[in-house]
Amino acid sequence: LQIQCYQCEEFQLNNDCSSPEFIVNCTVNVQDMCQKEVMEQSAGIMYRKSCASSAACLIASAGYQSFCSPGKLNSVCISCCNTPLCNGPRPKKRGSS
């Protein structure tokens, strides 16, 4: 089974690298998840993304969970997901009518 993820190995400033040129095919039977690192800096929000094995992503996200404080300077949030391109842009909230 092969999934695709968005990948940008170096931090991107205010660019969540969720456009087609960042799509990669993950290693079959090894990398079964997508991961994302979001860091909040004074210059703006920085993004890193890649494919990962489930073990690697879960070790990282569990080990650094306490560093995630959204809205706070130097916050670092790691997330893992296991569906194609799931580390892409957050779905926009639909307005209620």
Epitope: E9, E10, F11, C26, T27, V30, Q31, Q35, E37, M39, Q41, S42, A43, M46, R48, S50, C51, A52, S53, A55, A56, I59, A60, G63, Y64, F67, N74, V76, I78
Partner: antibody
Framework: EVQLVESGGGLVQPGGSLRLSCAAS????????IHWVRQAPGKGLEWVGR????????YYADSVKGRFTISADTSKNTAYLQMNSLRAEDTAVYYC?????????????WGQGTLVTVSS | DIQMTQSPSSLSASVGDRVTITCRAS??????VAWYQQKPGKAPKLLIY???FLYSGVPSRFSGSGSGTDFTLTISSLQPEDFATYYC?????????FGQGTKVEIK
């Protein structure tokens, strides 16, 4: 217990080649990046490069780009540093270390190092 | 590349002294900085990660602080086993460059 053991160092002539190994135990290398760091006699630490064994993705310092190649055999839980076109300035102790993908993660475990001497 | 400028390059101190080593990054690296201790003929050992977090098993006399571009390693009361060389390293972006090192010697 987590352990990294380097081997393969020795004396080699300028222009020659050498392959270093980094055998890991106590953890699975596919969950980490494996980094190579070197230290010339009496000098500081110099980052050489890294591999993510799960994808094979590598990155190299400019000083070794095009001459050194990092690879991994996940079935053996071992990473390698193939060094070609060696120069006198490559003489150093070579260490391997592990690091999670997360930017905040440090190199938490290191091998004991293996000495490479490039001399005629 | 992100450069790490470490100072001083060496210092002499006595047992019981408070020692401070600084590291300056050439750009904002948030808190993605680690500190290592190295003794002659040995591999580096991790002391501090994420700028201020003490690694498991490291004595509490070691502490780290800073964010952005300026970082500090402090040894609150120098012990005989602390005479060594100390390195900072940024892991914000490749290449993961180290500082030049600070050798702590006995006065």
């Amino acid at each position: 217990e987590v352990q990294l053991v380097e081997s393969g160092g020795g004396l080699v002539q300028p222009g020659g080649s050498l392959r270093l190994s980094c055998a890991a135990s106590g953890f699975t290398i596919t969950n980490y990046g494996i980094h190579w760091v070197r230290q010339a006699p009496g000098k500081g630490l110099e980052w050489v490069g890294r591999i993510y064994p799960d994808s094979g993705a590598t990155y190299y310092a400019d000083s070794v780009k095009g001459r050194f190649t990092i690879s991994a055999d996940t079935s053996k839980n071992t990473a390698y540093l193939q060094m070609n076109s060696l120069r006198a300035e490559d003489t150093a102790v070579y260490y391997c270390a592990r690091k999670l993908w997360v930017s905040l993660a440090p190199m938490d475990y290191w091998g004991q190092g293996t000495l490479v001497t490039v001399s005629s | 590349d992100i450069q790490m400028t470490q100072s001083p390059s060496s210092l002499s101190a006595s047992v019981g002294d408070r020692v401070t080593i600084t590291c300056r990054a050439s750009q904002d690296v948030s808190t993605a900085v680690a500190w290592y201790q190295q003794k002659p003929g040995k591999a580096p050992k991790l002391l501090i990660y994420s700028a201020s977090f003490l690694y498991s098993g490291v004595p509490s006399r070691f502490s780290g602080s800073g964010s952005g571009t300026d970082f500090t390693l402090t040894i609150s009361s120098l012990q005989p086993e602390d005479f060594a060389t100390y390195y900072c390293q940024q892991s914000y972006g490749t290449p993961f460059i180290f500082g030049q090192g600070t050798k702590v010697e006995i006065k």
